[in-house]
Interface confidence: low
């Protein structure tokens, strides 16, 4: 038999200890939140908030401007000064809870933990390719804010998620805040609200619609808002909350909340339980039917998918899919599965399940005993009755009240447990050619860029590298500018190319040339690299013969 070269084991064809240096910025304190802006005249910026300060960076992470956002009561606080002469409330540090772009103006809106959670609007002032912030406007009108009714109290110190939607000439802020009894009593933020930014930038219009955890449940029932996004006709919030109102705090699970993006109303507020599981190929004896549950969402991102993954998910290429990283939760017993799993929920399918849930609740014949749910927000009732009523009302429609859909949406880990001990703390998904790539940050300060494919029994890495030596967890917020993603870890912001930081971690020519085309890898004498790194011959088509 003819002699053949021995095969190089797959794991030996790559080295994830290879060091990559990516551009970074030291913010001078723990990065709290971050957002990017790309204008239509090639101007762009990265906005980075730390305690008491907001940095404006260029796309190259060079500092353009810095603004003092606290401490409240300090004469050096530049945002506080926009509210006129104080005092405006208790003094103290400002932790930025909300940093979002208002696309219509355009402007940056920041909301902090101080000054009753009020927000500041910073008009964007393009100067060449750089962006500066104009003097801030204080989004607070003292005369129409009271402790029990405060349209301008937006951010909760326990965490707030905001998505901004343009409706006609107005900008609406879809706001979701975590509450407890103390926060609810101090400056009355709401759990979920839709607030219209006043045209004169003096705050938010009074009389806004809102849902709040009922006072009797505030102590035991806390909702963490993990992510929010807008796609199609809806705004979505993702939450981690107790599975039961009566057993709260108890076991946690994940829900998707859907709100209309075309109507600033909460009558069509819907919730759906998201169920993510790890289902090993061979089920161990005693392992749960349907797979091991991973009920707690850590991070999420929605993105259109490439052709390959779309085929595996039985959806059309380019359709929007919600990706979530889930963990098992504290009370899940001894873990035999991976630390993190990733599940994919096509948005169209989520919408259909919600619409079907409305149909079950509101279309006759209604299944007896079907509850409307959301008893932490509203009085208990059975379908099709409105909350708190024991019979349908002739003047009101069943569909015009919040509803928890009675079925959950169950998916299994896309990675088949292959993330193993990796603890994922950040996620951003992109479509590159016909491939869908998950860009993940980890608890030990690494970046994993992995092709999303369901059918493989190994991970298709674009890269797996350490951001630095600090080993600090990569934070939840990830932003994109052009062909780069911005991750934060500790007090640093890092710029990571979507195509990966390089090719040097591929050790063999065969492995190098099998890398995805978008990575731009080629064989360069005795190493894998990109063409500009190779002074000599660079080959993408075939490998030299092994001697």
């Amino acid at each position: 038999k003819e002699w053949q070269c021995p095969r190089t084991p797959y794991a030996a064809s790559r080295d994830f200890n290879v060091k990559y240096m990516v551009p970074s910025f030291s913010a001078g304190g723990l990065v709290q939140t971050m957002v990017t802006y790309q204008g239509d005249k090639n101007e762009s910026a990265v906005f980075v908030a730390i305690r008491n300060r907001l940095h404006v960076l260029g796309p190259d992470l060079k500092s353009v401007q810095s603004l003092a956002t606290g401490p409240a009561g300090d004469p050096g606080c530049q945002t506080c000064a926009a509210c006129g002469p104080g005092p405006h409330g208790p003094s103290g540090d400002t932790d930025t809870k909300v940093l979002v772009l208002e696309p219509a103006l355009p402007a940056l809106v920041s909301c902090g933990s101080s000054l009753q959670g009020r927000c500041f609007l910073h008009d964007l002032d393009p100067q060449g390719t750089a962006v500066h912030l104009a003097a801030p406007a204080c989004l607070f009108s003292a005369h129409h804010n009271r402790p029990d009714d405060c349209p301008d109290c937006v951010a909760s110190p326990l965490g707030t998620r905001v998505t901004v939607v343009e409706q006609g000439q107005a900008s609406y802020f879809y706001v979701a805040s975590s509450l407890d009894a103390a926060v609810a009593a101090s400056f009355s933020p709401r759990s979920v609200s839709i607030r219209r930014l006043k045209a004169d930038a003096s705050g938010f219009a009074p009389g806004f619609v809102a849902l709040s955890v009922l006072p009797k449940h505030l102590v035991s029932y806390s909702i963490e808002y993990v992510h929010s996004f807008h796609t199609g006709a809806f705004v979505y919030f993702l939450t981690v909350q107790p599975a039961s109102v009566t057993d709260a705090p108890g076991a946690l699970h994940t829900r998707l909340a859907r709100l209309s993006a075309t109507e600033p109303e909460l009558g069509d507020y819907r919730e759906l339980v998201l169920d993510c599981r790890f289902a090993p190929k061979r089920r161990r004896r005693g392992a749960p039917e349907g797979g091991q549950p991973y009920p707690v969402l850590r991070v999420a991102h929605s993105a259109p998918v490439g052709a390959q993954l779309a085929t595996e998910l039985s959806i059309a290429e380019g359709q929007e899919v919600l990706f979530g990283v889930f963990v098992a939760g504290k009370d899940s017993g001894p873990g035999v599965g991976p630390n993190s799993v990733v599940c994919a929920f096509p948005i169209d399918l989520l919408d259909t399940l919600i619409d079907e849930g409305v149909e079950r609740c509101c279309e006759s014949p209604v299944h007896p005993g079907l509850r409307r749910g959301l008893d932490f927000f509203q009085s208990p009732s059975f379908c099709p009755n409105p909350p708190g009523l024991e019979a349908p009302s002739p003047n009101t429609s069943c569909r015009h009240f919040p509803l928890l859909v009675s079925s959950s949406f169950s998916r299994v880990d896309l990675f088949n447990g292959l993330l193993g001990t990796v603890e994922v703390t950040a996620l951003y998904v992109t479509r590159l050619d016909n491939v869908t790539v998950a860009h993940m940050g980890t608890a030990d300060g690494r970046i994993l860029q992995v092709e999303l494919a369901r059918s493989l029994n190994y991970l298709l890495y674009v890269s797996n590298f350490s951001l630095g030596d600090s080993g600090q967890p990569v934070q939840r917020d990830v932003s994109r500018l052009g062909d780069h993603l911005f991750f934060a870890s500790g007090d640093q912001v890092f710029q990571v190319p979507i195509q990966g930081p390089g090719c040097r971690h591929f050790l063999t020519c065969g492995r190098c040339l099998r890398a995805q085309r978008f990575m731009g890898c080629g064989w360069c004498g005795n190493m894998c690299g990109r063409q500009k790194e190779c002074p000599g011959s660079w080959q993408q088509d075939h490998c030299p013969p092994k001697l």
């Epitope: 006709a233 209309s260 109507e263 109303e265 096509p346 919408d351 429609s397 569909r399």
Partner: antibody, heavy 123, light 112 residues
């Protein structure tokens, strides 16, 4: 019982705007459902034009581009069609109809129709 | 847009005899929720259309059970087991799975 009644001019000149009204009785246009306009050309071809939902959001057939809009007057329980820059090709019988309550689509077909109003576009 | 093709365009029948109309769509009408939004409408002479069948096979209230609908994916059929005089008119299929909603060209059911 739910009833829909179309009304408007039977004759419109080319390049002018066509405005039609659909008056609904037996149901409130804010209570549920999508309220649609459909037209039938000579020769019987039917075309779905668009809807306004119970909440006031609208959805239009892309083939009508930006010439077409639907509005409503909830106090009169009416919804309206406006078609701008009409040509002879817009001559048809125009129907209003009630659809399902889905956000994206008019739901499972059209259960209730008006009797239709014939519109002729001619100089 | 989804094209709905009906055959035949005219169907001549005798009262009391069965009739069958076919409707084919240019793409599958199966929606992601497992439902197929295919409807059949009848337009009697001088009247507005009236829905007979929705979700492929569900009869509207008041529609006689001599009407039945069947099919899946892209191929659908409306059957009348015994034609009566009141059944004469033009039958249309309508899809509401995909945006925009589209109708078939119609099948005229007339007396032989």
């Amino acid at each position: 019982d739910v009833q829909l009644q179309e009304s408007g001019p039977g004759l419109v000149k080319p390049s002018q705007s066509l405005s039609l009204t659909c008056t609904v009785t037996g149901d409130s246009i804010t209570s549920d459902y999508a309220w649609n306009w459909i037209r039938q050309f000579p020769g019987n071809k039917l075309e779905w034009m668009g809807y306004i939902s119970y909440s006031g959001s609208t959805s239009y057939n892309p083939s009508l581009k930006s010439r077409f809009s639907i509005t409503r007057d909830t106090s009169k329980n009416q919804f309206f069609l406006q078609l701008n820059s009409v040509t002879t090709e817009d001559s048809a019988t125009y129907y209003c109809a009630r659809g399902g309550f889905y956000y994206r689509y008019a739901g499972p077909g059209f259960a209730y129709w008006g009797q239709g109003t014939l519109v002729t576009v001619s100089a | 847009d989804v094209v709905m093709t009906q055959t035949p365009l005219t169907l001549s029948v005798t009262i009391g005899q069965p009739a069958s109309i076919s409707c084919k769509s240019s793409q599958s009408l199966l929606y992601t929720n497992g439902k197929t939004y295919l409807n059949w409408l009848l337009q009697r002479p001088g009247q507005s259309p009236k829905r007979l069948i929705y979700l492929v096979s569900k009869l509207d209230s008041g529609v006689p059970d001599r009407f039945s609908g069947s099919g899946s994916g892209t191929d659908f059929t409306l059957k009348i087991s015994r034609v009566e005089a009141e059944d004469l008119g033009v039958y249309y299929c309508l899809q509401s799975t995909h945006f925009p909603l589209t109708f078939g060209a119609g099948t005229k059911l007339e007396l032989k």
